[in-house]
């Protein structure tokens, strides 16, 4: 039975040209995380495999940094980065857990930074 829950940064905003941390946290389960996929709509940004480590998709290599932890740092943000991001946790023996984050990249310097995992 899947007992775990994923806590995410939820809806967040950031300033164009800045950076943001996407963070998910899996709790309430003793299942082992075997791989975390970070995806944007149908695009794979990065994976972190428990054995093989991080692998960043080539098209994002210049703007995506692994971590902290199982999170993902997006850099040099553009307005086109606005949208849904998904953390997909593969676990044994539970199966797959998915968390959703909505990122809005703002032109102005009044981007709100209120999310739980957000860095200033």
């Amino acid at each position: 039975m899947m007992t775990g829950t994923i806590e995410t940064t939820g809806n967040i905003s950031a300033e164009k040209g800045g950076s943001i941390i996407l963070q998910c946290h899996l709790s309430s389960t003793t299942a082992q995380v075997t791989q975390v996929n970070w995806e944007q709509q149908d695009q794979l940004l990065a994976i972190c495999n428990a054995d093989l480590g991080w692998h960043i998709s080539p098209s994002f290599k210049d703007r995506v940094a692994p971590g902290p932890g199982l999170g993902l740092t997006l850099q040099s943000l553009t307005v086109n980065d606005t949208g849904e991001y998904f953390c997909i946790y593969h676990t044994y023996p539970d199966g797959t857990y998915t968390g959703r984050i909505f990122l809005e990249v703002l032109e102005s310097s009044v981007a709100e930074h209120g999310a739980r995992f957000q860095i200033p």
Partner: antibody, heavy 116, light 106 residues
Amino acid sequence: QVQLVQSGAEVKKPGSSVKVSCKASGYTFSRYWIEWVRQAPGQGLEWMGEIFPGSGGTNYNEKFKGRVTITADKSTSTAYMELSSLRSEDTAVYYCARHLGALDYWGQGTLVTVSS
Amino acid sequence: DIVMTQSPDSLAVSLGERATINCSASSSVSYIHWYQQKPGQPPKLLIYRTSNLASGVPDRFSGSGSGTDFTLTISSLQAEDVAVYYCQQYHSNPWTFGGGTKLEIK
């Protein structure tokens, strides 16, 4: 359900090359590493290399570098392992396997026999 | 390369008895995986990350250990457990397997 189906047995001459295919189904091929492992008759398992199909990124066992090339075709969800300059000691069963929390699904194996 | 040494090479155990297979790494590793291979079949994931049973594996199988010394235990051997067992490390590339332990019924 997850399946990895490999190409059929091959008989090759020393010095030639062989290309083994591994067709994946039942999961999103581009999202997970595929590894290649071989097993000589009556022997143990030997890791050859791996590919992340989503990007084409590869890692190889230094022992095979220059002789092995691993590729993937996302459009057909197929991974390939090509081994060149074959010698008799390359006679083995070659396996592909998906990597998710260790090698959790394996192909059925492809016997490659190198003989003059 | 990290060398994984399994002992014994072969083991004969009576049905219902305990079977123990050892795996020793030439340098310290974080964890290992165990695979079971039956004749004419590909290997099958048995235990991942030292002690976690893979999906569908009976709980008579268990794994333990740390550092350089690891153990696979079958608490009560069944006829279907006859196979070759391999350990594998993912600590340092190239990923290496042990030489295998052939388990038979006495």
